[in-house]
């Protein structure tokens, strides 16, 4: 599975959108987890509402928010007030019992604001108004890693 690299500015919000086959993943909750090391386990950060039909409701854990549009097949994760410590490898997952299927691998990179408190122009987006999409500077790196469907114990 290819890894998508998303860059966000420190102090701002970074929004990650993971798309999936809505029929294939019907009835399955979604989760956002942080991978501990290249081959390590993926530590759950936040998952969608326990009642699948309410998955559109935002669930928050700390500064991370998740919501799932189950009809469109898009789960959206927002990392608010991005900090240097948020950088790392993450996964969007589709859950089924003790199994977790990787929908997308995401490498989050945090950029320090080179202008400090000065006007950052088009790149600086106040958190209140909208999220820094990351897609503006998104690129993919092919890692040719197979999608796995391991138990999440």
């Amino acid at each position: 599975l290819n890894t998508t690299v998303l860059q966000g500015m420190a102090g701002q919000s970074l929004r990650v959108s993971c798309t999936y086959d809505a029929l294939k993943h019907w009835g399955r909750r979604k989760a956002w987890c942080r991978q501990l090391g290249e081959e390590g386990p993926c530590q759950r950060v936040v998952s969608t509402h326990g009642v699948w039909l309410l998955a559109f409701l935002k669930k928050r854990n700390g500064s991370t928010v998740i919501a799932d549009d189950t009809l469109a097949g898009t789960v959206t994760i927002t990392l608010k007030n991005l900090q240097a410590g948020d950088a790392g490898l993450y996964q969007c997952q589709s859950l089924r019992g003790r199994e977790a299927e990787v929908l997308q691998k995401v490498l989050v990179e945090v950029l320090e604001d080179p202008l400090d408190d000065q006007d950052a122009g088009d790149l600086w987006v106040p958190e209140e108004s909208s999220s820094f999409e990351g897609a503006q500077v998104e690129h993919s790196t092919s890692r040719n890693q197979e999608t796995s469907f391991p138990p999440t114990s």
Partner: antibody
Framework: EVQLVQSGAEVKKPGESLKISCKGS????????IGWVRQMPGKGLEWMGI????????RYSPSFQGQVTISADKSISTAYLQWSSLKASDTAMYYC????????????????WGQGTMVTVSS | EIVLTQSPATLSLSPGERATLSCRAS??????LAWYQQKPGQAPRLLIY???KRATGIPARFSGSGSGTDFTLTISSLEPEDFAVYYC?????????FGGGTKVEIK
Amino acid sequence: EVQLVQSGAEVKKPGESLKISCKGSGYSFTSYWIGWVRQMPGKGLEWMGIIYPGDSDTRYSPSFQGQVTISADKSISTAYLQWSSLKASDTAMYYCARAGHYDDWSGLGLDVWGQGTMVTVSS
Amino acid sequence: EIVLTQSPATLSLSPGERATLSCRASQSVSSYLAWYQQKPGQAPRLLIYDASKRATGIPARFSGSGSGTDFTLTISSLEPEDFAVYYCQQSSVHPYTFGGGTKVEIK
């Protein structure tokens, strides 16, 4: 009527290749997972693997990984099970079955089964 | 992989009697357990899924119970057509293994 129709019985020699089929009808073939199950003569059921025809996402039981290939052609609503080099121990009845229940709150329920394909491998 | 152990291997009963079949998992499978019936020369048929939910068209005399590692399939009053082999299957963790089966035969 929802049904899975499998290809006919096969008699093969060791070392030969084989591809058996399972054609779905009466439902949206691409929206349900299809599992394959082996039953050796006089024995129980063995799980081989599962495929989602919508995108050909496939999972194998470790016992069958590398021994068989599971595939699907969604354009003709057909799933396949194939061997590149058959062994006498592959002699068995092979079933395909639809996973009608398979989500976060519901376990796998193979609710529609094919009639089975008997594969005999003998020199 | 998860191992399912069914007991007894054979159950000899008369029509009208109650049949109790057991399936034990080597580790918890939550309620992700299904039961199938297979008659000679036929494909298996789904009876119960999610440990206790009857599949479409299955008579009320078939019931399932249990969660975690211990499960039971009960046939409240055996009909002549119920004499067959019964298999449990877990779908908690892939591979979705089957139990070895319990044969319910006429006494």
